[in-house]
């Protein structure tokens, strides 16, 4: 699906790192791990906790609707960032010289509005605002818009 | 556990300032992607929502109340506060606080304003 | 200020009636919608986010569906206890708004 214009036409300008060093937990409580090439994520149930991918979390303002939560995620200790691609894709990892301080057309796709409720954690597409961050069962994280993907994640 | 009380005159008369006040445990305002809501409900009506407020001071007003409204917060005490000033009879109605993404609500208290 | 426009206002239903809810937003609020559900003399009860996830400890009768501006809230098998004001809400921008309430009442 093509990238929504209404939020890609947003400015979303750096205001500070809010969580870091977490790690996020699917519905099947697998955990995330960084693919052999580097540039995917995927799910599993890990024995071998080092593998578990941790995260940074950015928060940033739109300048526009201060209604929603827009966010970047970084893997941790990298400059490797979460990036949408489209409905069931796979997430990709960006690799950005820094953190971005204004993201801007067609760079939204490493926005996401996060939103935690019921003590789960969403994370909606900017770029497609009608996709999740979601899972399956021992596959790439990838984007969704739901069922039969997983689209909550604990954070710990 | 969340937990939200509000607290406020019970009466006043048109023309007066109405002082409500939400206290509230389970989370802090200072943590970010936390918010306070209120939304009010006349008797036998409909919610309406009114203001927010949440962390790194955002504020976000309904824009038909927001020439008469200031919100604040003590975030040390976990107290949002909400001033309507030059109310009416039409501002008669239970008013409710709520969390960010309003899955819990206080019980609400009922504002009368009559001279 | 995005306007949603709930109907019926009114549902007379017997015990173990299926019942629907819709919700029309005035424009698109993507997914953004809550259905909640309000027993005479408490406050609002979240049953329904994001259009179609059910909250904590809701019973699976209750179901939502949509995307952008038409929503939908099904109860498959009304009870005696969902006697209610049933309300739809977007929050997808600010304003957040509600829906005018549909009050369900059991012959």
């Known amino acids: 699906s093509a990238p929504y214009t209404y939020q890609s036409d947003l400015r979303y300008k750096l205001m500070k790192l809010v969580r870091q060093k977490f790690v996020m937990n699917d519905s099947l409580n697998q955990t995330i791990y960084q693919d052999v090439d580097k540039h995917y994520l995927s799910t599993t149930w890990l024995n071998d906790l080092q593998q578990e991918v941790k995260f940074d979390m950015y928060a940033y303002s739109s300048g526009g609707d201060d209604s929603k939560y827009p966010v970047t995620l970084k893997i941790s200790d990298s400059q490797l960032f979460v990036s949408a691609q489209g409905e069931d894709q796979p997430v990709l990892l960006k690799e950005l010289p820094e953190t971005p301080k204004l993201i801007t057309g067609s760079e939204t796709d490493l926005i996401f509005f996060w939103k935690s409720i019921n003590s789960k954690n969403y994370f909606t597409s900017a770029a497609y605002p009608e996709l999740f961050i979601a899972t399956k069962e021992q596959s790439r994280v990838h984007l969704a818009r739901g069922l039969p993907s997983m689209t909550d994640f604990q954070i710990s | 556990q969340v937990i939200l009380k509000e607290s406020g005159p019970g009466i006043l008369q048109p023309s007066q300032t109405l002082s409500l006040t939400c206290s509230f445990s389970?989370?802090?305002?200072?943590?970010?992607?936390?918010?306070v809501n209120w939304i009010r409900q006349p008797s036998g009506k409909g919610l309406e929502w009114l203001a927010q407020i949440g962390s790194d001071d955002r504020k976000l007003y309904n824009p038909f109340l927001k020439s008469r409204i200031t919100l604040s917060e003590d975030t040390s005490n976990s107290q949002v506060f909400l001033k309507i000033t030059s109310v009416d009879t039409e501002d008669s109605a239970t008013y409710y606080c709520a969390n960010g993404v309003m899955e819990y609500w206080g019980l609400g208290t009922s504002v009368t304003v009559s001279s | 200020s995005i306007v949603m426009t709930q109907t019926p206002k009114f549902l007379l239903v017997s015990a173990g009636d299926r019942v629907t809810i819709t919700c029309k937003a005035s424009q698109s609020v993507n997914h953004d919608v809550a259905w909640y559900q309000q027993m005479p003399g408490q406050s609002p009860k979240l049953l329904i986010y994001f259009a179609s996830n059910r909250y904590t400890g809701v019973p699976d009768r209750f179901t939502g569906s949509g995307y952008g501006t038409d929503f939908t809230f099904t109860i498959s098998t009304v009870q005696a206890e969902d006697l209610a004001v049933y309300f739809c809400?977007?929050?997808?921008?600010?304003?957040?708004?509600f829906g005018g309430g549909t009050k369900l009442e059991i012959k």
């Open positions: 389970g989370f802090s305002l200072s943590t970010y992607g936390t918010a």
């Open positions: 809400q977007q929050d997808y921008s600010s304003p957040y708004t």
